[in-house]
């Protein structure tokens, strides 16, 4: 996934975000989420 | 801040093996989430790899998975990548990055500490 710079005159419409299960909680794995126009949604 | 430094690049021809290792100081490694990048002359950074602070959970881009393997030595402050059937195109200079555990692990602004990168070169 391409990461551009907030500033850059780039806009991050759609992309896939990756967080660890373990830093919210006991359970291993992958959470993925969508991040659209900056804002993070499941 | 971290202090983070990566060895093991070099010159491999196509369908070779290297071991990047990064090893790391200044702060409680076992705190920390790791993930490695690279960046090929003229593209952006991308993101290749990450292991969890325990190393129970990695996750990988979809263009290495099946060919690398990223993992860590806690007791050593240390965090590897293996990289196995190297192809041309995985040449570029790679970065280990640390991160703060909660941040999206594949997202290169999530992470605070930067190595000075080295350079792997995949000969055809």
């Known amino acids: 996934d391409a990461e551009f710079r907030h500033d850059s005159g780039y806009e991050v419409h759609h992309q896939k975000l990756v967080f660890f299960a373990e830093d919210v909680g006991s359970n291993k794995g992958a959470i993925i989420g969508l991040m659209v126009g900056g804002v993070v949604i499941a | 801040e971290v202090q983070l430094v990566e060895s093991g690049g070099g010159l491999v021809q196509r369908g070779g093996s290297l071991r990047l290792s990064c090893a790391a100081s200044?702060?409680?490694?076992?705190?920390?989430?790791m993930g490695w990048f690279r960046q090929a002359p003229g593209k952006e950074r991308e993101f290749q790899a990450a292991i969890s602070r325990s190393g129970g959970t990695t996750y990988y881009a979809d263009s290495v998975k099946g060919r690398f393997t990223i993992s860590r030595d806690n007791a050593k402050s240390t965090v590897f990548l293996q990289m196995n059937s190297l192809k041309p195109e995985d040449t570029a200079v790679y970065y280990c990055a640390a991160a703060s555990p909660g941040g999206p692990i594949n997202y290169g602004r999530a992470y605070d500490s930067w190595g000075q990168g080295t350079q792997v070169t995949v000969s055809s």
């Open positions: 200044g702060r409680t490694f076992s705190n920390l989430n």
